[in-house]
């Protein structure tokens, strides 16, 4: 069963800056992934950027860079101040689709104990929707 | 939970028509184009059969011009295809689509789960 996970860091030299890597753990293509902020895209959240394989990547503020890191996983650096600034406790959520085969979302947040600038290992998300 | 849901599918003989309805409901999309996209039996998924993003700007598939019509229902969270002068060709699985427009092209992030399309004397 395909899995995604989200895994987010926030910078040490610059606190309100924010780094959140998605990964997509299937053996499909992926089409597009959508990456939101306050919860799932569609249910609250906000829409942070966007990447299309082939045709390129769209980003809105405080979205910095949004790239791909592999052919199945992306990154994207937030940075912020004041409204449009992230908090500790903020959601972040990746959804990778595949059409017409389905999607698949995860979400997640910093770890509340974590020390600027450390994080754990990225490990699989819980899966919130598989279309 | 998004819910795109396609009706109006069927069987129809060639030169017919068929009108395809999708109705969206549990979200609030954010993306900026909605269309109809097509997979013919063992091929490839086409590119966006008929699109139209926020501006109301739509765009057709060469194949399609002058036979097929895209419309929308704001009022009624609704998408609808107009298919006429139908062909063979046109048999396949049609989908509704929400997404984001990349160099003019629509690409989707939800749909639904299709309705068959089939065109045969």
């Known amino acids: 069963t395909p899995e995604v996970w989200v895994q987010v860091r926030m910078e040490a030299t610059e606190l309100s800056s924010f780094t959140i890597r998605c990964g997509f753990l299937g053996s499909g293509s992926i089409s597009l992934v959508t990456v939101s902020w306050g919860g799932p895209n569609g249910a609250g959240g906000t829409t942070l950027a966007v990447l299309h394989p082939e045709r390129g990547i769209r980003q809105w503020a405080p979205a910095r860079q949004a790239r791909w890191e592999t052919q199945s996983s992306i990154s994207l650096i937030l940075e912020g101040s004041g409204a449009s600034s992230p908090c500790a406790n903020t959601t972040f959520c990746c959804k990778f689709a595949s059409f017409p085969e389905g999607s698949w979302e995860a979400c997640g947040s910093l770890p509340p104990s974590s020390d600027p600038g450390l994080s754990a290992p990225p490990t699989p998300a819980p899966i919130l929707r598989a279309d | 939970e998004v819910q795109l849901v396609e009706s109006g599918g069927g069987l129809v003989q060639p030169g017919g028509s068929l009108r395809l309805s999708c109705a969206a409901s549990g979200f609030t999309f954010s993306g900026d184009c909605m269309g109809w996209f097509r997979q013919a039996p063992g091929k490839g998924l086409d590119e966006g059969v008929a699109?139209?993003?926020?501006?109301?700007?739509?765009k057709y598939a060469d194949s399609v011009k002058g036979r097929f019509t895209i419309s929308r229902d704001n009022a009624k969270n609704s998408l609808y295809l107009q298919m006429n002068s139908l062909r063979a060709e046109d048999t396949a699985v049609y989908y509704c689509?929400?997404?984001?427009?990349?160099?003019?092209?629509?690409?989707?992030?939800?749909w639904g789960q299709g309705t068959q399309v089939t065109v045969s004397s």
């Open positions: 689509a929400a997404g984001w427009t990349f160099g003019g092209q629509c690409s989707p992030a939800d």
């Open positions: 699109t139209i993003d926020n501006a109301g700007r739509i």
